[in-house]
Protein backbone atom coordinates (compact mmCIF):
# COMPACT_ATOMS: atom_id res chain seq x y z
CA UNK A 1 0.00 0.00 0.00
CA UNK A 2 0.49 3.37 -0.72
CA UNK A 3 2.12 5.31 2.42
CA UNK A 4 -0.65 6.79 4.41
CA UNK A 5 -2.85 3.55 3.67
CA UNK A 6 -1.10 0.99 6.13
CA UNK A 7 -2.61 -2.15 7.74
CA UNK A 8 -1.14 -3.67 11.19
CA UNK A 9 2.29 -5.37 10.69
CA UNK A 10 2.78 -8.73 11.92
CA UNK A 11 6.25 -9.81 11.76
CA UNK A 12 7.48 -13.59 11.71
CA UNK A 13 10.61 -15.21 11.32
CA UNK A 14 11.33 -17.36 8.29
CA UNK A 15 11.41 -20.83 8.53
CA UNK A 16 9.46 -20.98 11.88
CA UNK A 17 5.71 -21.12 12.58
CA UNK A 18 3.77 -17.57 11.83
CA UNK A 19 0.21 -16.82 13.06
CA UNK A 20 -1.65 -14.50 11.38
CA UNK A 21 -4.29 -13.27 14.01
CA UNK A 22 -7.76 -12.62 13.50
CA UNK A 23 -10.07 -12.34 16.25
CA UNK A 24 -13.03 -9.81 15.08
CA UNK A 25 -15.14 -9.19 18.03
CA UNK A 26 -18.43 -10.97 17.56
CA UNK A 27 -21.35 -10.44 19.13
CA UNK A 28 -22.16 -12.43 22.05
CA UNK A 29 -25.67 -13.43 19.85
CA UNK A 30 -23.11 -14.88 17.16
CA UNK A 31 -21.09 -16.82 19.54
CA UNK A 32 -23.40 -20.06 19.34
CA UNK A 33 -23.42 -19.68 15.53
CA UNK A 34 -19.80 -20.20 14.62
CA UNK A 35 -20.01 -23.45 13.73
CA UNK A 36 -21.58 -22.07 10.68
CA UNK A 37 -19.10 -19.72 10.73
CA UNK A 38 -17.32 -19.26 7.23
CA UNK A 39 -13.73 -17.66 6.54
CA UNK A 40 -11.20 -17.12 3.49
CA UNK A 41 -8.24 -15.88 3.77
CA UNK A 42 -6.66 -14.25 1.03
CA UNK A 43 -3.09 -13.29 -0.05
CA UNK A 44 -1.68 -10.10 -1.90
CA UNK A 45 1.73 -10.71 -2.24
CA UNK A 46 4.23 -7.97 -1.72
CA UNK A 47 5.09 -6.28 -5.52
CA UNK A 48 8.16 -7.39 -7.60
CA UNK A 49 10.10 -5.80 -9.83
CA UNK A 50 7.80 -3.75 -12.37
CA UNK A 51 6.56 -5.50 -15.08
CA UNK A 52 2.84 -5.52 -17.05
CA UNK A 53 0.63 -5.45 -14.20
CA UNK A 54 -1.70 -8.97 -13.93
CA UNK A 55 -5.43 -8.27 -14.33
CA UNK A 56 -7.92 -8.51 -11.31
CA UNK A 57 -8.36 -12.20 -10.69
CA UNK A 58 -11.94 -11.53 -10.68
CA UNK A 59 -13.31 -8.09 -11.70
CA UNK A 60 -11.53 -5.33 -13.82
CA UNK A 61 -8.15 -4.78 -13.20
CA UNK A 62 -7.01 -2.26 -10.16
CA UNK A 63 -4.71 0.29 -10.23
CA UNK A 64 -2.70 1.47 -6.80
CA UNK A 65 -2.96 5.32 -6.77
CA UNK A 66 0.52 5.40 -6.25
CA UNK A 67 3.65 6.55 -7.94
CA UNK A 68 3.90 4.76 -11.92
CA UNK A 69 7.52 3.51 -10.38
CA UNK A 70 5.80 1.06 -7.91
CA UNK A 71 6.10 -2.31 -9.11
CA UNK A 72 2.53 -3.68 -9.84
CA UNK A 73 0.66 -5.80 -7.04
CA UNK A 74 1.10 -9.99 -7.71
CA UNK A 75 -2.59 -11.48 -8.55
CA UNK A 76 -4.19 -12.09 -5.31
CA UNK A 77 -5.31 -15.70 -4.28
CA UNK A 78 -7.70 -17.57 -1.54
CA UNK A 79 -5.15 -19.11 0.71
CA UNK A 80 -7.71 -21.19 2.16
CA UNK A 81 -11.53 -20.83 2.73
CA UNK A 82 -13.56 -22.89 5.21
CA UNK A 83 -17.46 -22.86 4.34
CA UNK A 84 -19.88 -23.45 6.63
CA UNK A 85 -20.13 -27.26 6.80
CA UNK A 86 -16.23 -27.15 7.53
CA UNK A 87 -15.51 -27.84 3.83
CA UNK A 88 -12.25 -26.47 2.65
CA UNK A 89 -10.30 -24.88 -0.39
CA UNK A 90 -6.83 -23.17 -1.12
CA UNK A 91 -4.56 -23.01 -3.20
CA UNK A 92 -1.20 -25.66 -3.45
CA UNK A 93 1.73 -26.12 -2.83
CA UNK A 94 1.00 -23.25 0.34
CA UNK A 95 -2.01 -25.23 1.77
CA UNK A 96 -0.41 -28.31 2.92
CA UNK A 97 0.98 -25.78 5.40
CA UNK A 98 -1.35 -23.88 6.12
CA UNK A 99 -4.01 -24.18 9.19
CA UNK A 100 -7.13 -23.13 10.68
CA UNK A 101 -7.33 -23.81 14.67
CA UNK A 102 -10.54 -25.86 14.09
CA UNK A 103 -11.79 -25.53 18.33
CA UNK A 104 -10.26 -22.18 17.87
CA UNK A 105 -12.41 -21.14 15.32
CA UNK A 106 -15.62 -22.12 17.53
CA UNK A 107 -14.05 -19.61 20.29
CA UNK A 108 -14.23 -16.87 17.55
CA UNK A 109 -10.75 -16.79 16.05
CA UNK A 110 -9.77 -17.36 13.03
CA UNK A 111 -5.79 -16.98 12.90
CA UNK A 112 -4.28 -18.38 9.75
CA UNK A 113 -1.01 -20.38 10.95
CA UNK A 114 1.62 -20.78 8.60
CA UNK A 115 3.95 -23.98 9.41
CA UNK A 116 6.54 -22.97 8.26
CA UNK A 117 6.33 -19.55 6.77
CA UNK A 118 7.94 -18.54 3.96
CA UNK A 119 9.78 -15.75 2.19
CA UNK A 120 7.18 -15.49 -0.58
CA UNK A 121 4.15 -15.60 2.06
CA UNK A 122 5.11 -11.76 2.76
CA UNK A 123 2.45 -9.21 1.87
CA UNK A 124 -0.99 -8.01 2.64
CA UNK A 125 -3.35 -10.59 3.87
CA UNK A 126 -7.16 -9.93 4.40
CA UNK A 127 -9.50 -12.69 6.35
CA UNK A 128 -13.33 -12.12 5.22
CA UNK A 129 -15.12 -14.02 7.91
CA UNK A 130 -18.89 -14.72 7.06
CA UNK A 131 -20.97 -15.46 10.41
CA UNK A 132 -24.95 -16.24 10.11
CA UNK A 133 -26.34 -12.31 9.85
CA UNK A 134 -22.90 -9.89 9.37
CA UNK A 135 -19.41 -10.30 8.24
CA UNK A 136 -16.45 -8.87 9.34
CA UNK A 137 -12.91 -8.73 8.37
CA UNK A 138 -9.11 -8.74 9.73
CA UNK A 139 -6.47 -7.26 7.16
CA UNK A 140 -3.33 -7.14 8.18
CA UNK A 141 0.43 -7.12 6.52
CA UNK A 142 3.00 -9.78 6.96
CA UNK A 143 6.70 -8.97 6.87
CA UNK A 144 9.07 -12.24 7.13
CA UNK A 145 12.86 -11.55 8.66
CA UNK A 146 15.93 -13.45 9.00
CA UNK A 147 17.25 -14.34 12.35
CA UNK A 148 21.26 -14.97 12.63
CA UNK A 149 23.85 -14.94 14.99
CA UNK A 150 26.97 -14.45 14.20
CA UNK A 151 30.65 -14.68 15.76
CA UNK A 152 34.22 -12.30 15.51
CA UNK A 153 36.40 -13.89 15.18
CA UNK A 154 34.57 -16.92 13.52
CA UNK A 155 35.29 -20.89 13.38
CA UNK A 156 36.90 -22.46 16.38
CA UNK A 157 38.66 -20.62 18.79
CA UNK A 158 41.42 -21.68 21.48
CA UNK A 159 41.07 -20.91 24.92
CA UNK A 160 42.13 -17.59 26.27
CA UNK A 161 40.99 -16.04 22.90
CA UNK A 162 38.38 -13.06 22.89
CA UNK A 163 35.21 -13.59 20.89
CA UNK A 164 32.15 -11.51 20.31
CA UNK A 165 28.60 -13.40 19.00
CA UNK A 166 26.07 -10.75 17.82
CA UNK A 167 22.39 -11.55 17.20
CA UNK A 168 20.82 -10.20 14.71
CA UNK A 169 17.22 -10.19 13.06
CA UNK A 170 16.17 -8.26 9.89
CA UNK A 171 13.58 -5.78 10.77
CA UNK A 172 14.05 -2.01 11.05
CA UNK A 173 13.35 -1.34 14.69
CA UNK A 174 15.59 -2.29 17.56
CA UNK A 175 14.51 -4.82 19.89
CA UNK A 176 13.17 -3.82 22.63
CA UNK A 177 14.77 -6.16 24.82
CA UNK A 178 17.79 -9.08 24.51
CA UNK A 179 18.35 -11.93 26.48
CA UNK A 180 21.11 -14.29 26.19
CA UNK A 181 21.00 -17.89 27.60
CA UNK A 182 23.26 -21.07 27.57
CA UNK A 183 21.47 -24.41 27.26
CA UNK A 184 23.22 -26.86 29.61
CA UNK A 185 21.44 -30.07 30.40
CA UNK A 186 18.97 -28.91 33.00
CA UNK A 187 17.77 -26.54 30.35
CA UNK A 188 18.66 -22.65 29.80
CA UNK A 189 20.75 -20.99 31.73
CA UNK A 190 20.34 -16.88 31.91
CA UNK A 191 23.80 -14.96 30.86
CA UNK A 192 24.47 -12.07 33.47
CA UNK A 193 26.89 -9.42 33.20
CA UNK A 194 30.41 -10.87 34.84
CA UNK A 195 34.23 -10.35 34.53
CA UNK A 196 33.67 -13.10 31.58
CA UNK A 197 30.76 -11.97 30.45
CA UNK A 198 30.08 -8.55 29.25
CA UNK A 199 26.41 -7.41 27.12
CA UNK A 200 25.58 -4.61 24.90
CA UNK A 201 22.56 -4.31 23.47
CA UNK A 202 22.63 -7.28 20.90
CA UNK A 203 26.22 -8.14 21.71
CA UNK A 204 27.70 -10.91 24.19
CA UNK A 205 31.59 -10.33 24.48
CA UNK A 206 33.51 -13.14 26.11
CA UNK A 207 37.19 -11.92 26.57
CA UNK A 208 39.03 -14.87 27.71
CA UNK A 209 37.32 -18.03 26.55
CA UNK A 210 37.67 -21.79 27.43
CA UNK A 211 36.97 -25.28 26.89
CA UNK A 212 33.93 -24.62 29.14
CA UNK A 213 32.30 -22.32 26.97
CA UNK A 214 32.27 -24.76 24.04
CA UNK A 215 28.61 -25.63 23.07
CA UNK A 216 25.31 -23.89 22.31
CA UNK A 217 24.90 -20.28 23.34
CA UNK A 218 21.20 -18.16 22.30
CA UNK A 219 19.57 -15.32 22.63
CA UNK A 220 15.75 -13.96 22.53
CA UNK A 221 14.96 -10.81 20.91
CA UNK A 222 11.99 -9.15 22.25
CA UNK A 223 10.43 -6.25 20.36
CA UNK A 224 7.65 -3.94 20.98
CA UNK A 225 4.81 -5.62 19.59
CA UNK A 226 5.71 -8.64 21.43
CA UNK A 227 7.24 -10.90 18.40
CA UNK A 228 10.11 -12.90 20.19
CA UNK A 229 12.87 -14.44 18.10
CA UNK A 230 15.30 -17.04 19.57
CA UNK A 231 18.91 -18.10 18.07
CA UNK A 232 21.35 -20.51 19.00
CA UNK A 233 25.44 -20.65 18.01
CA UNK A 234 27.45 -23.51 18.34
CA UNK A 235 30.49 -22.28 20.04
CA UNK A 236 33.53 -24.33 19.38
CA UNK A 237 36.75 -24.02 21.94
CA UNK A 238 39.61 -25.77 21.44
CA UNK A 239 41.43 -27.32 24.40
CA UNK B 1 -19.59 -4.60 -21.48
CA UNK B 2 -20.37 -5.07 -18.16
CA UNK B 3 -24.02 -4.73 -17.57
CA UNK B 4 -26.67 -4.30 -14.40
CA UNK B 5 -30.34 -3.40 -15.66
CA UNK B 6 -32.67 -3.42 -12.68
CA UNK B 7 -36.68 -3.34 -13.57
CA UNK B 8 -40.01 -3.92 -11.17
CA UNK B 9 -40.00 -0.25 -9.74
CA UNK B 10 -43.18 1.77 -9.42
CA UNK B 11 -45.66 3.11 -7.19
CA UNK B 12 -47.29 1.38 -4.12
CA UNK B 13 -49.44 1.43 -1.81
CA UNK B 14 -48.23 1.50 1.91
CA UNK B 15 -48.53 -2.53 3.05
CA UNK B 16 -48.03 -3.74 -0.65
CA UNK B 17 -45.35 -5.67 -2.17
CA UNK B 18 -43.31 -5.34 -5.24
CA UNK B 19 -40.43 -6.96 -6.16
CA UNK B 20 -37.21 -5.76 -7.78
CA UNK B 21 -35.31 -7.93 -10.72
CA UNK B 22 -31.52 -7.27 -11.83
CA UNK B 23 -30.53 -8.80 -15.40
CA UNK B 24 -26.61 -9.17 -15.65
CA UNK B 25 -24.50 -9.32 -18.81
CA UNK B 26 -20.71 -9.16 -19.54
CA UNK B 27 -19.37 -11.19 -16.74
CA UNK B 28 -19.76 -14.51 -14.74
CA UNK B 29 -22.81 -13.61 -12.48
CA UNK B 30 -22.74 -16.80 -10.29
CA UNK B 31 -18.94 -15.83 -9.95
CA UNK B 32 -19.91 -12.83 -7.58
CA UNK B 33 -21.62 -11.91 -4.62
CA UNK B 34 -24.25 -9.14 -5.46
CA UNK B 35 -26.08 -6.24 -3.32
CA UNK B 36 -28.91 -4.16 -3.25
CA UNK B 37 -28.35 -0.31 -2.36
CA UNK B 38 -30.96 2.60 -2.02
CA UNK B 39 -30.94 6.26 -2.10
CA UNK B 40 -34.29 8.10 -1.01
CA UNK B 41 -34.88 11.01 -3.26
CA UNK B 42 -32.10 13.95 -2.36
CA UNK B 43 -30.29 11.73 0.46
CA UNK B 44 -27.73 9.31 0.95
CA UNK B 45 -26.81 5.76 -0.09
CA UNK B 46 -28.21 3.00 2.05
CA UNK B 47 -27.15 -0.38 2.14
CA UNK B 48 -30.29 -2.69 2.24
CA UNK B 49 -29.14 -6.27 1.54
CA UNK B 50 -26.17 -8.77 -0.04
CA UNK B 51 -26.09 -12.34 -1.20
CA UNK B 52 -22.42 -14.35 -1.55
CA UNK B 53 -22.00 -15.80 -4.73
CA UNK B 54 -22.81 -19.14 -3.72
CA UNK B 55 -26.02 -18.27 -2.02
CA UNK B 56 -24.68 -19.04 1.51
CA UNK B 57 -24.73 -16.53 3.24
CA UNK B 58 -27.11 -13.30 3.27
CA UNK B 59 -27.59 -10.28 4.64
CA UNK B 60 -30.25 -7.34 5.53
CA UNK B 61 -30.37 -3.52 7.10
CA UNK B 62 -32.20 -3.82 10.10
CA UNK B 63 -34.30 -1.34 8.44
CA UNK B 64 -35.44 -4.06 5.90
CA UNK B 65 -35.00 -7.49 8.09
CA UNK B 66 -38.02 -9.68 8.19
CA UNK B 67 -39.82 -7.70 4.89
CA UNK B 68 -37.28 -7.82 2.41
CA UNK B 69 -35.81 -11.24 0.54
CA UNK B 70 -32.91 -11.24 -1.64
CA UNK B 71 -32.69 -14.28 -3.79
CA UNK B 72 -30.26 -14.99 -7.10
CA UNK B 73 -31.09 -17.53 -10.10
CA UNK B 74 -27.86 -18.11 -11.42
CA UNK B 75 -28.85 -19.85 -14.45
CA UNK B 76 -30.98 -16.74 -15.55
CA UNK B 77 -28.02 -14.77 -14.37
CA UNK B 78 -30.65 -12.37 -12.43
CA UNK B 79 -30.84 -11.25 -8.80
CA UNK B 80 -34.17 -9.70 -7.18
CA UNK B 81 -35.29 -8.22 -3.74
CA UNK B 82 -38.82 -9.14 -2.58
CA UNK B 83 -39.96 -6.57 -0.46
CA UNK B 84 -43.34 -6.96 1.38
CA UNK B 85 -44.79 -4.71 4.02
CA UNK B 86 -43.67 -1.90 1.82
CA UNK B 87 -43.66 1.60 3.94
CA UNK B 88 -43.40 5.50 2.68
CA UNK B 89 -39.53 5.69 4.20
CA UNK B 90 -38.48 2.70 1.17
CA UNK B 91 -39.06 4.87 -1.68
CA UNK B 92 -36.03 5.01 -3.33
CA UNK B 93 -33.96 4.51 -6.30
CA UNK B 94 -33.28 0.89 -6.00
CA UNK B 95 -29.57 0.27 -7.03
CA UNK B 96 -28.51 -3.85 -8.14
CA UNK B 97 -24.94 -3.89 -7.69
CA UNK B 98 -22.07 -5.88 -8.15
CA UNK B 99 -19.73 -7.15 -4.79
CA UNK B 100 -15.75 -7.06 -5.76
CA UNK B 101 -15.36 -9.70 -4.26
CA UNK B 102 -16.64 -11.96 -1.82
CA UNK B 103 -14.46 -11.31 0.79
CA UNK B 104 -13.93 -7.46 -0.41
CA UNK B 105 -17.49 -5.53 0.51
CA UNK B 106 -17.19 -2.69 -1.93
CA UNK B 107 -19.39 -1.83 -5.04
CA UNK B 108 -17.55 -2.18 -8.60
CA UNK B 109 -20.80 -1.91 -11.01
CA UNK B 110 -23.95 -0.31 -10.55
CA UNK B 111 -27.06 -0.53 -12.47
CA UNK B 112 -29.03 2.49 -13.62
CA UNK B 113 -31.23 2.14 -10.81
CA UNK B 114 -35.17 1.68 -10.71
CA UNK B 115 -37.33 3.99 -8.75
CA UNK B 116 -40.03 2.49 -5.74
CA UNK B 117 -42.27 4.97 -4.67
CA UNK B 118 -44.49 4.06 -1.73
CA UNK B 119 -47.72 6.67 -1.23
CA UNK B 120 -51.44 6.20 -0.68
CA UNK C 1 -22.63 -0.27 13.31
CA UNK C 2 -19.86 1.80 12.24
CA UNK C 3 -20.47 5.59 11.44
CA UNK C 4 -19.41 7.32 8.40
CA UNK C 5 -18.95 10.87 8.54
CA UNK C 6 -18.26 13.37 5.82
CA UNK C 7 -16.74 16.89 5.56
CA UNK C 8 -17.50 19.18 4.40
CA UNK C 9 -20.97 18.54 3.40
CA UNK C 10 -20.27 20.89 0.59
CA UNK C 11 -17.46 22.28 -1.28
CA UNK C 12 -17.46 25.09 -4.12
CA UNK C 13 -14.00 25.47 -6.04
CA UNK C 14 -12.80 26.29 -9.12
CA UNK C 15 -11.75 24.14 -12.38
CA UNK C 16 -7.59 23.26 -11.70
CA UNK C 17 -8.13 23.78 -8.08
CA UNK C 18 -7.07 20.93 -5.47
CA UNK C 19 -9.76 19.49 -3.64
CA UNK C 20 -9.58 17.47 -0.60
CA UNK C 21 -12.71 15.34 1.14
CA UNK C 22 -12.60 13.80 4.53
CA UNK C 23 -14.08 10.92 5.95
CA UNK C 24 -14.17 9.79 9.56
CA UNK C 25 -14.95 6.31 10.93
CA UNK C 26 -16.65 5.56 14.43
CA UNK C 27 -14.45 2.54 14.64
CA UNK C 28 -11.08 1.51 13.68
CA UNK C 29 -11.81 -0.12 9.64
CA UNK C 30 -8.07 -0.37 8.88
CA UNK C 31 -7.98 0.15 4.94
CA UNK C 32 -11.32 -1.15 4.29
CA UNK C 33 -12.87 2.23 2.67
CA UNK C 34 -14.07 3.13 -0.87
CA UNK C 35 -14.98 6.17 -2.58
CA UNK C 36 -17.90 6.76 -5.02
CA UNK C 37 -18.33 9.34 -7.19
CA UNK C 38 -22.39 10.48 -8.47
CA UNK C 39 -24.01 12.98 -11.04
CA UNK C 40 -27.07 14.01 -10.64
CA UNK C 41 -29.48 11.23 -12.29
CA UNK C 42 -26.98 9.07 -12.64
CA UNK C 43 -25.65 5.48 -10.30
CA UNK C 44 -22.73 5.96 -8.41
CA UNK C 45 -19.14 5.13 -9.91
CA UNK C 46 -16.53 3.59 -8.17
CA UNK C 47 -13.10 5.77 -7.77
CA UNK C 48 -10.83 4.69 -4.69
CA UNK C 49 -11.30 1.03 -3.09
CA UNK C 50 -9.03 -0.44 0.25
CA UNK C 51 -8.37 3.68 1.12
CA UNK C 52 -5.43 4.01 -1.84
CA UNK C 53 -6.21 1.99 -4.81
CA UNK C 54 -7.50 3.61 -7.84
CA UNK C 55 -10.19 1.68 -9.73
CA UNK C 56 -9.81 1.12 -13.31
CA UNK C 57 -10.18 3.79 -15.47
CA UNK C 58 -10.08 6.13 -13.26
CA UNK C 59 -8.09 9.49 -13.92
CA UNK C 60 -5.06 9.53 -11.49
CA UNK C 61 -5.50 12.91 -10.17
CA UNK C 62 -7.69 11.41 -7.95
CA UNK C 63 -6.27 9.59 -5.29
CA UNK C 64 -6.99 8.46 -1.49
CA UNK C 65 -5.27 7.97 1.91
CA UNK C 66 -5.83 7.22 5.23
CA UNK C 67 -6.15 4.13 7.84
CA UNK C 68 -7.64 3.55 11.14
CA UNK C 69 -10.19 6.11 11.31
CA UNK C 70 -9.40 9.05 9.05
CA UNK C 71 -9.49 8.68 5.17
CA UNK C 72 -9.01 11.32 2.61
CA UNK C 73 -10.33 11.92 -0.93
CA UNK C 74 -8.32 14.28 -3.07
CA UNK C 75 -8.38 15.42 -6.17
CA UNK C 76 -5.34 17.33 -7.31
CA UNK C 77 -6.45 19.66 -10.57
CA UNK C 78 -10.18 20.12 -10.80
CA UNK C 79 -11.80 19.21 -13.79
CA UNK C 80 -15.24 20.41 -15.67
CA UNK C 81 -16.13 16.87 -15.17
CA UNK C 82 -15.49 16.38 -11.40
CA UNK C 83 -18.31 18.75 -10.14
CA UNK C 84 -20.28 15.66 -8.17
CA UNK C 85 -21.34 14.41 -4.99
CA UNK C 86 -18.87 12.08 -3.45
CA UNK C 87 -19.59 9.59 -0.66
CA UNK C 88 -17.00 7.12 1.07
CA UNK C 89 -18.02 3.80 2.53
CA UNK C 90 -16.43 1.13 4.88
CA UNK C 91 -16.28 -1.91 3.82
CA UNK C 92 -14.30 -3.59 6.69
CA UNK C 93 -17.75 -4.92 8.24
CA UNK C 94 -21.47 -5.69 7.67
CA UNK C 95 -23.86 -3.71 7.80
CA UNK C 96 -21.90 -1.77 4.92
CA UNK C 97 -22.14 1.60 5.43
CA UNK C 98 -21.90 5.17 3.60
CA UNK C 99 -20.55 8.64 4.46
CA UNK C 100 -23.59 11.26 3.35
CA UNK C 101 -22.06 12.65 0.52
CA UNK C 102 -20.06 16.01 -0.08
CA UNK C 103 -21.82 17.99 -3.07
CA UNK C 104 -18.46 19.68 -5.40
CA UNK C 105 -20.04 22.55 -6.47
CA UNK C 106 -18.49 25.08 -9.60
CA UNK C 107 -17.57 28.45 -7.83
Known amino acids: LQPGAEVPVVWAQEGAPAQLPCSPTIPLQDLSLLRRAGVTWQHQPDSGPPAAAPGHPLAPGPHPAAPSSWGPRPRRYTVLSVGPGGLRSGRLPLQPRVQLDERGRQRGDFSLWLRPARRADAGEYRAAVHLRDRALSCRLRLRLGQASMTASPPGSLRASDWVILNCSFSRPDRPASVHWFRNRGQGRVPVRESPHHHLAESFLFLPQVSPMDSGPWGCILTYRDGFNVSIMYNLTVLG | QVQLVESGGGLVKPGGSLRLSCAAS????????MSWIRQAPGKGLEWVSY????????YYADTVKGRFTISRDDAKNSLYLQMNSLRAEDTAVYYCTRVAYDYEWYFDVWGQGTLVTVSS | DIQMTQSPSSVSASVGDRVTITCKAS??????VAWYQQKPGKAPKLLIYSASYRYTGVPSRFSGSGSGTDFTLTISSLQPEDFATYYC?????????FGQGTKLEIK
Open chain 2, 51 to 58: VTSGGDYI
Open chain 3, 89 to 97: QQHDSSPWT
Open chain 3, 27 to 32: QDVTTA
Open chain 2, 26 to 33: GFTFSSYA
